[in-house]
Interface confidence: low
Amino acid sequence: SQVSQNCHNGSYEISVLMMGNSAFAEPLKNLEDAVNEGLEIVRGRLQNAGLNVTVNATFMYSDGLIHNSGDCRSSTCEGLDLLRKISNAQRMGCVLIGPSCTYSTFQMYLDTELSYPMISAGSFGLSCDYKETLTRLMSPARKLMYFLVNFWKTNDLPFKTYSWSTSYVYKNGTETEDCFWYLNALEASVSYFSHELGFKVVLRQDKEFQDILMDHNRKSNVIIMCGGPEFLYKLKGDRAVAEDIVIILVDLFNDQYFEDNVTAPDYMKNVLVLTLSPGNSLLNSSFSRNLSPTKRDFALAYLNGILLFGHMLKIFLENGENITTPKFAHAFRNLTFEGYDGPVTLDDWGDVDSTMVLLYTSVDTKKYKVLLTYDTHVNKTYPVDMSPTFTWKNSKLPNDITGRGPQ
């Protein structure tokens, strides 16, 4: 039902859903700190623009009695319960920040009259694509899919001279929330990725994955998986791997590859790591000192959600426009705003654009090196290392099907 918004007369409120079920197991206190740091910045920016208004956040906690799995499995009802709580208290802000789980976002979007914007740190799944009042500040599955298709088709680089059209996808059901939806998108038979590939098989058992590594009858040399190097090691160990196997390890929200003095373990030599170009201002900020690299991205998304709201509020106030209108609710897209860590670009559907980075392990230095970058905004790949010191033959990525074409 329609809830009146605390969003006028110089006082603007942000409703922040503090859900027990979250895309990342982050103490809610850290997210509060992130939101509060964002509020300080927004207040300063509005003041500098000569806009004498009040901006606050209301943190809406669920009781946690029923929906306490801690992950996203029971988030659907928790999100709706929180909305009911907001409705009963008549305390809806100008914007809703959270939820982060795909299930809850999808259901909340369906079950509410969305005359206000929703900003999510997560909601990675394809079911949350193309939602008119939803903004997602962490790379959704669609962006990953577009990179993979672009990379598979690329055949004009010194280190990749073959188009690929096949892949195995390893998905065993124990994945984190982001990985679950990324792999789900690749598995879906109607997705862009599946449509563009000629062969794709999902490996669901550890043994299936392990067998493929040396199987002479395998249908593809390329295996996509999602997680960190430790996850790969648990699965692969020190097993021998055929020389033309390429493992693509999707590990978007992990800065560890960029830290000083990081050496790539030997089991990573057949692996290309797909991650995001890191930011750094959070390293010294008050709320992030104790955060892991992944959690830093999650907290940053909450903070940037606040900054995005401040950006839009400033524009609408300067233009003398009303905040509680569908126009405002639909405005959080197709723009660039000043995020905490530099400019943040949102695409036509309100999804964050980013620079994805494909890393390889140099056989000379045992360091992670950048092979190429990919700009999700323009769907374009930019080669970086034209002479990579690969483990693969002739310093080129192999064909995806053994024995097809010159090796």
């Epitope: 590859y257 750094n280 860590d341 400019p343 360091k367 950048v370």
Partner: nanobody, 133 residues
Framework: QVHLVESGGGSVQSGGSLRLSCAAS????????RGWFRQTPGKEREGVAT???????SYADSVKGRFTISQDNAKNTLYLQMNGLKPEDTAMYFC???????????????????????????WGQGTQVTVSS
């Protein structure tokens, strides 16, 4: 190799302003950031200001609040607006482009003028700035 050409230097009184420009041409696909450095005779080249590909600026403490670095990616040009110039700003100013394939180079902290290792950097020829009291 990237070709960098600086312009805009000259002589100015203390408290005055200058705007330096740097036009870049050639392959820039591996750029991490661009920046301005300066050097006085007998001293090491020091970082003044840098800006990442996404537009994140960093400044040496000695110029913070007085100098502003900016870029026009469409024109492939880097700028340094210098206000409140002091005699100690007198130096040869160089434009630089930082490039590397190492993952760590993508880290914006590496692009801070105080922390910038000078491997993988293309330099311009420099433009002289003289500030008299």
């Amino acid at each position: 190799q990237v070709h960098l050409v600086e312009s805009g230097g000259g002589s100015v009184q203390s408290g005055g302003s200058l705007r330096l420009s740097c036009a870049a041409s050639g392959y820039t696909g591996r750029r991490l950031c661009r920046g301005w450095f300066r050097q006085t005779p007998g001293k090491e080249r020091e970082g003044v200001a840098t800006i990442t590909l996404s537009g994140r600026a960093s400044y040496a403490d000695s110029v913070k609040g007085r100098f502003t670095i900016s870029q026009d990616n469409a024109k492939n040009t880097l700028y340094l607006q210098m206000n409140g110039l002091k005699p100690e700003d007198t130096a040869m100013y160089f434009c630089a482009e930082v490039r590397s394939a190492d993952a760590e180079w993508l880290n914006p902290l590496k692009c801070h003028p105080d922390r910038l290792g000078l491997a993988g950097v293309d330099w311009g020829q420099g433009t002289q700035v003289t500030v008299s009291s």
